[in-house]
């Protein structure tokens, strides 16, 4: 008993310590360690039924999807999948967990967000962090050098998510990737085209796609005087420029990451620039940057990319942004990120980004990491941030107070009198067999008013009403729920009439 009391006190003290560290904005690693200690203490404490009421909830960073939310989700997925298929993609699936070794060393600073599974008898496993690394593993394992595929699945990140902004620990990713040796920038341009098609089709508001190139970034850091070992960590600071001011980024680079102030200033001169193809041209003339082989390659490819984007009719949606430095270690070339734009408060102001909704880039070295001979398979791809899109679509529908149908039922089989359950069962079965989406109420003698009310609530457009007289006449009364108009339809014509009214093809092909 004394031991339990001591442990309870330690849990309380450790909890206070964690809160204190968070308030002091202590280092992420220290907070992470102290939180881990707190969890270990709690695990030793175990359940105490007398004190602890089990709180029924989903784990942190996860959520259930209601039928309404699922209806939204399916509509969003439908738009995305149609687009992926329009561009000739095949579909694959991979396990939700991978060997830990597969994921190690692929994500740089983000590796700490990977969920490791408890040992299940020998194999060290981790939940997948994205769909790209498993895709690269799939290519290497199957010795594939050429594929255009999409993959829609859940991924897992041990993040501290702001769920109100559509960020979770378990969330869907919708990825499209092109693997293979092709002429420069053609697949990359198609990926950007796909991104623009999807975001336009979803009608979630105006957007901008920021584009940069890892080689330009690395070249720029080199000429500014950043040592190789600091490239990645400085990248992660630069990437924050869409959220915080240059001053704050500079302070982080100098104060926390040990960069010389004059080096930071040189970086600042570059990364605060954004524009179109004219900026690419301008940088190709830059006396320092144009002398760097990597940067020159990157700028040459971007010039070509802009030509293709113009031909695809999307150049107005693209901005060359030198501050874009996507966090993942595996990018090697072009990188891009789509952000939704808030309407500016006043005319003449710059549009404000409200968060990334899609991103991607070229990763030519990732497959080679899995190949015993290091054979490379060039890849380029994109990922649609559907969770954020779901949130935006849901909010928009709520604001419009739009009713969303959560079922696809075309017709309710109803009866106007008692003792007609058998007839309703026979008719609904006929309709199901003919491919009609039909329902009936699970009552022997439902009131007609209740049946009609159910249709109103569920958004079912038609009611097929059986009555004694109709049975004698060999007809069914077909009623439109919205107009309340009723017509007698011969029983043998009912299927065709329902299909005609609901715009369904007449044969199940």
């Amino acid at each position: 008993m004394a031991e339990r009391a001591a442990l309870e006190e330690l849990v309380k003290l450790q909890g206070e310590r964690v809160r204190g560290l968070k308030q002091q904005k202590a280092s992420a690693e220290l907070i992470e360690e102290e939180v881990a200690k707190l969890l270990k203490l709690k695990a030793q404490l175990g359940p105490d039924e007398s004190k602890q009421k089990f709180v029924l909830k989903t784990p942190k960073g996860t959520r259930d999807y209601s039928p309404r939310q699922m209806a939204v989700r399916e509509k969003v997925f439908d738009v995305i999948i149609r687009c992926f298929k329009r561009h000739g993609a095949e579909v694959i699936d991979t396990p939700v967990f991978e060997l830990k070794e597969t994921l190690m060393g692929k994500y740089g600073e983000d590796s700490k967000l990977i969920y490791d599974l408890k040992d299940q008898g020998g194999e060290l496993l981790s939940l997948r962090y994205d769909l790209t690394v498993p895709f690269a593993r799939y290519l290497a394992m199957n010795k594939l050098t050429n594929i255009k595929r999409y993959h829609i699945a859940k991924v897992y990140r041990r993040d501290n998510p702001a769920m109100t902004r559509g960020r979770y620990r378990e969330f869907y990713q919708c990825d499209f990737d092109i693997a293979g040796n092709f002429d420069p920038m053609i697949p990359d341009a198609e990926c950007l085209k796909i991104m623009c098609e999807i975001l336009s089709s979803l009608q979630i508001g105006d957007f901008l796609v920021k584009v940069n190139d890892r080689r330009i970034l690395d070249g720029m850091f080199a000429i500014c005087g950043v040592s190789d070992s600091k490239f990645r960590t400085i990248c992660s600071s630069v990437d924050k420029l869409d959220k915080v001011s240059w001053e704050e980024v500079k302070n982080e680079m100098v104060g926390e990451k040990g960069l010389a102030p004059e080096v930071a200033d040189r970086i600042g001169d570059y990364v605060q620039q954004h524009g179109g193809v004219s900026l690419v041209e301008q940088l190709l003339q830059d006396p320092k940057l144009s002398q760097n082989k990597q940067a020159l390659e990157g700028l040459g490819d971007l010039k070509l990319l802009f030509e293709y984007l113009t031909l695809f009719g999307i150049d107005d949606k693209i901005s060359f942004d030198l501050s874009l430095a996507r966090g993942l270690d595996y990018y090697t070339g072009v990188i891009y990120e789509a952000v939704l734009l808030q309407t500016p408060a006043q005319a003449g102001e710059e549009p404000l980004g409200v968060g990334s909704v899609a991103a991607g880039g070229r990763y030519d070295g990732l497959v080679g990491m899995f190949d015993p001979k290091g054979r490379k398979v060039p890849c380029v791809g994109l990922s649609i941030g559907v969770e954020r899109i779901f949130s935006i679509v849901e909010q928009r529908l709520e604001a419009l107070e739009e009713k969303i149908r959560t079922t696809e039922t075309q017709v309710l089989v109803a009866s106007a009198q008692k003792k007609l359950l058998e007839e309703r069962l026979k008719l609904v079965s006929e309709l199901w067999d003919a491919g009609i989406k039909a329902e009936l109420l699970y009552k022997k003698n439902p009131k007609l008013l209740n049946q009609l009310q159910y249709c109103e609530e569920a958004g079912i457009p038609l009611v097929a009403i059986i009555g004694e007289q109709e049975l004698k006449d060999g007809v069914i009364k077909l009623r439109s729920v919205t107009s309340r108009e009723e017509v007698d339809v011969r029983r043998e014509d009912l299927v065709e009439e329902i299909k005609r009214r609901t715009g369904q093809p007449l044969c199940i092909c």
């Epitope: 001591a6 442990l7 006190e9 330690l10 003290l13 206070e16 310590r17 690693e29 360690e33 881990a36 200690k37 270990k40 203490l41 030793q44």
Partner: antibody
Framework: QVQLVESGGGLVKPGGSLRLSCAAS????????MSWIRQAPGKGLEWVSY????????KYTPSVRGRFTISRDNAKNSLYLQMNSLRAEDTAVYYC?????????????WGQGTLVTVSS | DIQMTQSPSSVSASVGDRVTITCRAS??????LAWFQQKPGKAPKLLIF???NLESGVPSRFSGSGSGTDFTLTISSLQPEDFATYYC?????????FGQGTKLEIK
């Protein structure tokens, strides 16, 4: 019962190296943070370093940082301290110690200690 | 680093006496304090953790109190086996530091 047995101490010249080991038994070693604590002859106690249960976190007192490396092998129930560039002021009895309740930085079990003497 | 200051550095007492040793932290450490007993040639032994919790197997004549910066170890009735050196230690933040010790001697 809980047992910690240190080994590897001895006489070494300044600038030399030593590797201390600690063999643990009587508890689930892989669940516990572990530490090295030292005591110079006739002096007080100094917490040198610690390592977390799965080796994810390690820390060192400033005077040894960059010279000492703590490590563990959970499969062998062993804790180690690699000491390089040794100085006269590192002379002490080195104790291997277990954290209280797995993660609390209070040593609830200690070894008998191993003496390290740094002298020319 | 957090400095721990013990007083007195040494104390003489007789069997049956009540003895109090104090420990002061250079900054607030909540209740993250432990007391150890060490006898010559032996490893320290944990007596009290988080200021006032008695480690199992430690006689109830030992007690601890305090929080923040000021802490006390009390031995209510000294026994012959209690003559030793006593150390306090803060477990609030790394590097975890010990007091310089209080030597309890027979009068």
């Amino acid at each position: 019962q809980v047992q910690l047995v240190e080994s590897g101490g001895g006489l070494v010249k300044p600038g030399g190296s030593l590797r201390l080991s600690c063999a643990a038994s009587g508890f689930t070693f892989s669940d516990y943070y572990m530490s090295w604590i030292r005591q110079a002859p006739g002096k007080g106690l100094e917490w040198v370093s610690y390592i977390s249960d799965k080796s994810r976190y390690t820390k060192y007192t400033p005077s040894v940082r960059g010279r000492f490396t703590i490590s563990r092998d959970n499969a062998k129930n062993s804790l180690y301290l690699q000491m390089n560039s040794l100085r006269a002021e590192d002379t002490a009895v080195y104790y291997c110690a277990r954290y209280l309740y797995q993660v609390i930085a209070i040593a609830d079990a200690w070894g008998q200690g191993t003496l390290v003497t740094v002298s020319s | 680093d957090i400095q721990m200051t013990q007083s007195p550095s040494s104390v003489s007492a007789s069997v049956g006496d009540r003895v109090t040793i104090t420990c002061r932290a250079s900054q607030g450490i909540s209740s993250w304090l432990a007391w150890f007993q060490q006898k010559p040639g032996k490893a320290p032994k944990l007596l009290i953790f988080v200021a006032s919790n008695l480690e199992s197997g430690v006689p109830s004549r030992f007690s601890g109190s305090g929080s923040g910066t000021d802490f006390t170890l009390t031995i209510s009735s000294l026994q012959p086996e209690d003559f030793a050196t006593y150390y306090c230690q803060q477990a609030e933040s790394f590097p975890y530091t010990f007091g310089q010790g209080t030597k309890l001697e027979i009068k």
